[in-house]
């Protein structure tokens, strides 16, 4: 017989030789890390058809590192579902935990005898420290001192000391969360008031109010003859400006003898075509829209408006 | 608080023009929207524009092609010009702050008196 | 332009009596509407903002209803100052209009 087999768990006793004869013999021992369990057979013998009889490993079994507990609130998970060495422990928190110490623990070898790399670690609440202190608001608890995980708080603003109140920017309510950091940031409190918003030769149809705040939406037509250039509806943004600008109502163009236009008064469309004109003044004809340059209110329009001149 | 003060009213004769200033004092009137307002026995109160914090401007369309507000900031003044005047265009013209942008008229000038007579 | 108008164009009234002015508008606007007082050779003065919003310093015995194309000033309880003409004003469309005006005289 040629060379004896090799295996991964078990070596040869002695050296080996390049030929055997038949009904030589020759025995295996567990390898550094391997212990042998009977009773299976740990040797082989060379037959007549030149060949080692069967044998395996099977009979040696790696060394394992000493079991580990479930961390309290927390798990620990073999990887490969197995404690031998070479392989790993991965820790992990139930919700509302953290993780102090090693997530992953290997089971290494030293000497003979198999051994975690580290303490296994453990898991400790998840604690938030009081959320921010907002400027013109406050939040629930907040005589607390220490939060717990998933403890949620909610903003609110102080009534203002002028005539138009606070308004909250953001999210009212955050929350404990993993990492013990807070969900997001706190909300602002600040008195958002947008303009009342003008539209020549057009008028709102809903959002109607006093005065209009953060998240008031407007929604606007323009008048027979006209067609909406912009969004017919805005909202107050938290700048205090409309999102998207107030809207402009302009002229329908009298019909060109080629082709007759397709704008209705309740039309949106958008218009590549013209640029906004500076405040003009003196006489103007009365088919151009009023002048304006503020935000969001009618300005002037060149080139279509122009080219009726 | 921001007062206005209006001038430059007098007698014009018809087809003549007029430049009524409102003089802003406690104040920036580049500050504030500005509206001007005239009034007569004849016709009431009548609104005929605004010129607003950036300098746009709106109008009555029954105005707009006689009638021209602008501002000097340097001067801290709004203007009303007028042209082609009427005999009906005599009235009290008063300018006056809209309310924190808002068409509340709650800021009036004393007014001033323009008559047009031949 | 929208149209308003006032009912009656004037009135009599006395110390004490509760009065009512009527602004009607040919077409909705909604509650975009104030009401100004003014006394002889004086500009008009802010009473209510947008129906029945009160001016500051204006007094409680001023109250504004109303809405869509009728509205209402009421003066509960009139007092010796409160002998003027009052306008309404619509701005829920350019241009901005007022209502002729009422005057409320001395019986």
């Known amino acids: 017989c040629e060379e004896p087999p090799t295996f991964e768990a078990m070596e040869l006793i002695g050296k080996p030789k390049p030929y055997y004869e038949i009904g030589e013999r020759v025995d295996y021992k567990c390898k550094k890390g391997y212990f042998y369990i009977p009773p299976l057979a740990t040797h082989t013998i060379c037959d007549r058809n030149h060949t080692w009889l069967p044998v395996s490993d099977d009979a040696c079994y790696r060394e394992t590192c000493p079991y580990i507990r479930d961390p309290l609130n927390g798990q620990a998970v073999p990887a490969n579902g197995t404690y031998e060495f070479g392989y790993q422990m991965h820790f992990i928190c139930n919700e509302g935990y953290y993780l102090i110490g090693e997530e992953i623990l290997y089971c290494e070898l030293k000497g003979s005898v198999a051994i975690w790399s580290g303490k296994p670690p453990i898991c400790e609440k998840v604690l938030c420290t009081p959320p921010p202190k907002i400027k013109n608001g406050k939040h629930t608890f907040s005589e607390v001192e220490v939060f717990e995980y998933l403890d949620a708080v909610t903003y609110s603003c102080d009534p203002a000391p002028g005539p138009d109140p606070f308004s909250l920017i953001g999210e009212s309510t955050i929350y404990c969360g993993d990492n013990s950091v807070w969900s997001r940031a706190a909300p602002e409190c600040k008195v958002v008031k947008c303009r009342f918003p003008v539209v020549e030769n057009g008028k709102q149809i809903s959002g109607f109010g006093k005065k209009f705040y953060y998240k008031a939406t407007v929604m606007f037509e323009c008048d027979k003859g006209f067609y909406l250039d912009g969004s017919d509806t805005i909202v107050c943004d938290s700048n205090s400006t409309w999102d998207p600008p107030v809207p402009k109502c302009l002229k329908v163009l009298p019909p060109s003898s080629t082709k007759p236009p397709a704008l209705s008064h309740s039309v949106s469309t958008s218009s590549t075509t013209k640029s906004p004109a500076s405040s003009a003044s003196g006489p103007r004809p009365t088919y151009k829209p009023p002048v304006s340059n503020y935000p969001g209110y009618p300005k002037p329009e060149e080139g279509i408006l122009d080219s009726l001149d | 608080e921001v007062q206005l003060v209006e001038s430059g009213g007098g007698l014009v004769q018809p087809g003549g023009s007029l430049r009524l200033s409102c003089a802003a004092s406690?104040?920036?009137?580049?500050?504030?929207?500005i509206s001007w307002i005239r009034q007569s026995p004849s016709r009431g109160l009548e609104w005929l524009g605004v010129?607003?914090?950036?300098?746009?401007?709106n109008y009555n369309s029954a105005f707009m092609s006689r009638f021209t507000i602008s501002r000097d900031d340097s001067k801290n003044t709004a203007y009303l010009q007028m042209n082609s005047l009427k005999t009906e265009d005599t009235a009290v013209y008063y300018c006056?702050?809209?309310?924190?942008?808002?068409?509340?008229?709650?800021?009036w000038g004393q007014g001033t008196l323009v008559t047009v007579s031949s | 332009a929208i149209q308003l108008t006032q009912s009656p164009s004037s009135l009599s009234a006395s110390v004490g009596d509760r009065v009512t002015i009527t602004c009607r508008a040919l077409?909705?606007?909604?509650?975009?509407l104030n009401w100004y007082q003014q006394k002889p050779g004086k500009a008009p003065k802010l009473l209510i903002y947008y129906t029945s919003s009160l001016h500051s310093g204006v007094p409680s015995r001023f109250s504004g209803s109303g809405s869509g194309t009728e509205f209402t000033l009421t003066i509960s309880s009139l007092q010796p100052d409160d002998f003027a003409t009052y306008y309404c004003?619509?701005?829920?469309?350019?241009?901005?209009?007022f209502g002729q005006g009422t005057k409320v005289e001395i019986k």
């Open positions: 004003q619509q701005y829920i469309k350019l241009p901005w209009t």
């Open positions: 406690g104040g920036s009137v580049s500050s504030y929207d």
């Open positions: 010129i607003w914090t950036d300098g746009g401007t």
């Open positions: 077409q909705g606007i909604s509650n975009y």
């Open positions: 006056e702050r809209v309310y924190d942008g808002y068409p509340w008229f709650a800021y």
